[in-house]
């Protein structure tokens, strides 16, 4: 046997190079037929009506043909015929590599609330071979469930993933991408998640920055509160009390001026949104005022110094405590 | 100059065989198909067959059972035997170079089947 | 399925066009070859392939193709071109040659 041939790999659309070699060439007819065993070339003429079929290159060694614009229809066995004694026949397989047609996401719903369990399918339309359909949710890569249906030698892949979202995928891309031999780089969609949460409470003391809180003094608390959708109601109370009369209520702050021990106790912030309620509580302890002493002798005291000096003249048992902050959710 | 040149018996009786040979003159006698082709008086042509150098055939379904195509490589001749001739095998007989179509031509013979 | 089917005459004025036909179903995938044949005289290729031309052969021959049928149209025909001209082609396998029955033109004037 000294025809040789070998076979081809193409993607749809792109051009197949066929090349019949031969060698010790006695100069003998040489054809190529299509698999329908139809001639395209004899020798150097092409009695097919195929145009898509050019010759590249005819000598009494090869036969080398391009075929434009490869179709699904093309593949097969293209064989080429050497007229020696014996006749010798190879023949060379033609792959025809069809990339996606389309690369769909479906999310089951828009908004998904925090907890649920969501369903994200990808639909990997008409390849050859099927495709490889890979999941991530950010740079995390997830596992999903393909099905591959089959069409006229074309392949249809959908991968369902079960995702359960967490306020922290809210804005987060979920991302189907393919893998396939004719698709070069990163063919990929991606839709990104929308997660309702509940609020989550933070109470901020704005006023007195350091912190303590004595008897005569203001105390200014700001609540925070952050969930999707933005909570509408943010609600001051106090827990198992009214309310001080002296206490003013402004949108998200709370002002209580001339702080006295009657004023101890817990003020809670709550704030709700469709998906939930939620609450953060403040703990409030009224210090005694601070006694009078005359400034200090030395010059050049530090912030350090003087902090201690403070701390050394309360006499309260719980002298240096804070007011303290507790974030519960409901 | 390239060309084919043929000769053979030109009067037969039925029942023999008609024996033809063709000669071509030129380079690549294994790069092509010859052919043998026939037509009657007054009616259309009629291919007959084809050999190649190696001696790959193909003939004519309605003449298959009594014609023979050989040849001889060493002289760049190609041959066509016809047995059991009648008076409707009478023709001008071709041989010609194919390379698919026949893109050169012997002068022919005329054949007559007569008793 | 293997025959090739020509109108048997066609006549032309002189230095008019005429266009010869041949119909049959390997001229969906083949193309035909056409041949002009005078008296007494072996065929001549005039056509062969899409639309090619031996040499010697003069620019008014020309070919086409459309489904199963394939044209042979001579623009501006001359005397000389009176004549008989056939197609040919291959049968569906290509292993086996097939002529139309042929088409005898005349060139009037």
């Known amino acids: 046997q000294n025809l040789f041939t070998k076979d081809v790999t193409v993607i749809e659309g792109e051009v197949a190079t066929i090349s019949c070699q031969v060698n010790k060439s006695d100069d003998s007819v040489i054809q190529l037929l299509n698999p329908n065993r139809q001639t395209i070339y004899f020798r150097d003429f092409r009695p097919l009506k195929d145009s898509r079929f050019q010759l590249l290159n005819f000598s009494s060694s090869e036969l080398k043909v391009s075929l434009t614009n490869v179709s699904i229809s093309d593949e097969g066995r293209y064989f080429c015929q050497l007229y020696t004694d014996p006749p010798q026949e190879s023949y060379t397989t033609i792959t025809v590599l069809v990339p996606p047609r389309n690369l769909m996401i479906d999310i089951q719903r828009d908004t998904a609330v925090e907890g649920e369990e969501i369903e994200v399918n990808c639909t990997a339309m008409a390849s050859k071979p099927a495709t490889t359909i890979r999941w991530f949710k950010g740079n995390t890569e997830l596992k999903g469930k393909s099905e591959v249906e089959e069409w006229s030698d074309m392949y249809t892949v959908t991968s369902q993933l079960m995702l359960k979202v967490h306020k922290e995928d809210d804005g987060v891309p979920v991302i189907c991408q393919v893998e396939h031999p004719a698709v070069t780089g990163n063919l990929q969609t991606q839709r990104y998640l929308e997660v309702q949460y509940k609020p989550q409470v933070h109470i901020q003391m704005t006023y007195p920055l350091q912190g303590l809180t004595r008897e005569g003094d203001a105390l200014e608390l700001t609540c925070e509160a952050i969930g999707k959708p933005q909570p509408v109601m943010v609600t001051w109370v106090r827990v198992d009390d009214e309310m001080p009369q002296h206490a003013v209520l402004s949108g998200p702050n709370l002002f209580i001026n001339n702080l006295n021990k009657t004023d101890n106790g817990t003020y809670r912030c709550e704030a709700s949104n469709i998906v939930g309620k939620a609450h953060s509580d403040y703990m409030l302890y009224v210090y005694d005022p601070p006694t009078t002493i005359p400034p200090p002798t030395t010059t050049t005291t530090t912030t350090t110094t003087t902090t201690t000096t403070i701390l050394t003249i309360i006499t309260d048992s719980r002298a240096g405590e804070e007011g303290s902050i507790r974030a519960v959710d409901h | 100059q390239v060309q084919l040149q043929q000769w053979g018996a030109g009067l037969l009786k039925p029942s023999e065989t008609l024996s033809l040979t063709c000669a071509f003159y030129g380079e690549s006698f294994s790069g092509y198909y010859w052919s043998w082709i026939r037509q009657p008086p007054g009616k259309g042509l009629e291919w007959i067959g084809e050999?190649?150098?190696?001696?790959?055939?193909n003939y004519n379904p309605s003449l298959k059972s009594r014609v023979t195509i050989s040849v001889d490589t060493s002289k760049n001749q190609f041959s066509l035997k016809l047995n059991s001739v009648t008076a409707a095998d009478t023709a001008v007989y071709y041989c010609?170079?194919?390379?698919?179509?026949?893109?050169?031509w012997g002068r022919g013979t005329l054949v007559t089947v007569s008793s | 399925s293997s025959e090739l089917t020509q109108d048997p005459a066609v006549s032309v004025a002189l230095g008019q066009t005429v266009r010869i036909t041949c119909q049959g179903d390997?001229?969906?995938?083949?193309?035909a070859s056409w041949y002009q044949q005078k008296p007494g005289q072996a065929p001549v290729l005039v056509i062969y392939g899409k639309n090619n031309r031996p040499s010697g052969i003069p620019d008014r021959f020309s070919g086409s193709s459309s489904g199963n049928t394939a044209s042979l149209t001579i623009t501006g025909a001359q005397a000389e071109d009176e004549a008989d001209y056939y197609c040919n082609s291959r049968d569906s396998s290509g292993n086996h040659v097939v002529f139309g029955g042929g088409t005898m033109l005349t060139v009037l004037g």
């Open positions: 050999i190649n150098h190696s001696g790959s055939t």
């Open positions: 390997s001229l969906r995938s083949y193309y």
């Open positions: 010609a170079r194919s390379s698919w179509y026949f893109d050169l």
